[in-house]
């Protein structure tokens, strides 16, 4: 099983501060649930890195939901989570900045931003809500930070994890920083499994970031998010390498699953998403 052979590089706490999520559910989308109540609740928005208000319907939903702003902050934010270090080194744009706008195959049309290589600026476009490509940003600022040239022709680069909004995901961007800081897994590996909107029951796999394994789920045939793979191998190949867990005594480690008897106590309360 290829899962057994995957290992993470051990990384210490002395590096540039990554975006730190206290709990994996802090990366979930705000989910109002199927009910119709109007209840003011708070969720952690991974794009703004802040706790924000949303309207909860009163049932179901997910764990990224808090009664108060204070509770949300306590569970999902850290003092240095907003620290972004900007460089003035000449950097290349990530390759995806040169991709054409891609609405994807779904029909939940929303406004997103992409970098238009013809006009050399970020522009809004009509996104269908699923798939597409990584030249897709929730805000104009994200798009500009990643794909537009900064002052004096310099590319603005962020060492803190860049937040890309394709399917509400953390998207570390490809930048020329030392390989020590590389995060090899795609952003959507942190998102929960999403059945989507249709009625099919297709066998798919998603990466469960809490347990660090690929798990099966039933896909409806449309919608959903990109944490959706046709085989376990594909899922592992895409997600397994990049996920880093923090052990309780400090330091970052990924256990070797092959050695079934070896037990490593994982403290799931803190998930570090390292920047590329």
């Amino acid at each position: 099983d290829s899962e057994e052979d995957e290992e993470h590089t051990i990384i210490t706490d002395t590096e540039l501060p990554p975006l730190k999520l206290m709990h994996s559910f802090c990366a979930f989308k705000a989910d109002d649930g199927p009910c119709k109540a109007i209840m003011k609740r708070f969720f952690f928005n991974i794009f703004t890195r802040q706790c924000e208000e949303f309207i909860y319907g009163g049932c179901e939903g997910n764990q990224n939901r808090f009664e108060s702003l204070e509770e949300c902050k306590k569970m999902c934010t850290r003092d240095n989570a907003n620290r972004i270090i900007k460089t003035t080194l000449q950097q290349e744009k990530p390759d995806f900045c040169f991709l054409e706008e891609d609405p994807g195959i779904c029909r939940g049309y929303i406004t997103r931003y992409f970098y238009n290589n013809q006009t050399k600026q970020c522009e809004r476009f009509k996104y269908g809500g699923c798939l597409g490509n990584m030249n897709n940003f929730e805000t104009l600022e994200e798009c500009k930070n990643i794909c537009e040239d900064g002052p004096n022709g310099f590319q603005v680069d962020n060492y803190g994890t860049q937040l890309n909004a394709v399917n509400n995901s953390l998207t570390p961007q490809s930048t020329k920083v030392p390989s020590l800081f590389e995060f090899h897994g795609p952003s959507w590996c942190l998102t929960p499994a999403d059945r989507g909107l249709c009625r099919a029951n297709e066998n798919r796999f998603y990466y469960n970031s809490v347990i660090g394994k690929c798990r099966p789920f039933k896909y409806s045939g449309c919608g959903g998010n990109e944490n959706n793979f046709t085989s376990k191998q594909e899922c592992l190949r895409a997600c397994k390498k990049g996920f880093i867990q923090r052990i309780s005594k400090g330091g970052l480690i990924k256990t070797k699953r092959k050695r079934k008897k070896q037990r490593v106590k994982i403290a799931y309360e803190e998930i570090f998403v390292k920047n590329m």
């Epitope: 949303f54 309207i55 706008e101 939940g108 929303i110 406004t111 970020c122 522009e123 809004r124 476009f125």
Partner: antibody, heavy 119, light 108 residues
């Protein structure tokens, strides 16, 4: 000075088509979206669609997708909207309006073209 | 599509009074994507407020906008004669872009 000048009023029979024009001046025509919005007598505003002339990017309101056709002539800085299979409910004032590429702040509007559909 | 419902349909007030116009969305709309337009009889609409609360050029400071999620408000602190018009809210978060049916602010 930015100006959007629309073509004159139209009287059409049900089932016919109408093609409206909107001539832009005072700005770089290809660098902005051109929207088409209509307003039936005494009613609210209804967005029909938008076109970005440089790359011919077009987004339609699904309601109008089968009947509306948006085009643009870069050489004359003119946007067009053709509406086919007209019915009485299409009687309205049709506006063109421009917005930037990053939002839909329609900061300049044409004067409007009245289209009357009547047998 | 996101349906924007404005209330009241007509608001009759006198100059000097405070006006509160509401716009309710059928689904949550980010505040950045909620705009207001003013329209006077025989004229095209005019951009009035963008991003929920940012006044367009030339709009007097007596106007203000607020709200989040599904509830948005346009407030005029003290009505002037030139404020009487129809106001439309507009969202561009989701396609198709939509407008409310308008609130007509008339002189009492």
């Amino acid at each position: 000075e930015v100006q959007l000048v629309q073509s004159g009023a139209e009287l059409k029979k049900p089932g016919a088509s109408v093609k409206l024009s909107c001539k832009a001046s005072g700005y770089t025509f290809t660098s902005y979206w051109m929207h088409w919005v209509r307003q039936a007598p005494g009613q609210g505003l209804e967005w029909i669609g938008e076109i970005k002339p440089d790359q011919g990017r077009i987004n339609y309101n699904e309601k109008f997708k089968t009947r509306a056709t948006l085009t643009a002539d870069k050489s004359t800085s003119t946007a067009y909207m053709e509406l086919s299979s007209l019915r009485s409910e299409d009687t309205a004032v049709y506006y063109c309006a421009r917005s930037s590429v990053v939002d839909t702040a329609m900061d300049y509007w044409g004067q409007g073209t009245t289209v009357t559909v009547s047998s | 599509e996101i349906v924007l419902t404005q209330s009241p349909a007509t608001l009759s007030l006198s100059p000097g009074e405070r006006a509160t116009l509401s716009c309710s969305a059928s689904s949550s709309v980010s505040s950045s994507y909620l705009y207001w337009y003013q329209q006077k009889p025989g004229q095209a609409p005019r951009l009035w407020i963008s991003g929920t609360s940012i006044l367009a050029s030339g709009v007097p400071a007596r106007f203000s906008g607020s709200g989040s999620g599904t509830k948005y408000t346009l407030t005029i602190s003290s009505l002037e004669p030139e404020d009487f018009a129809v106001y439309f809210c507009h969202q561009w978060s989701h396609y198709p872009f939509t407008f409310g049916q308008g609130t007509k602010l008339e002189i009492k």
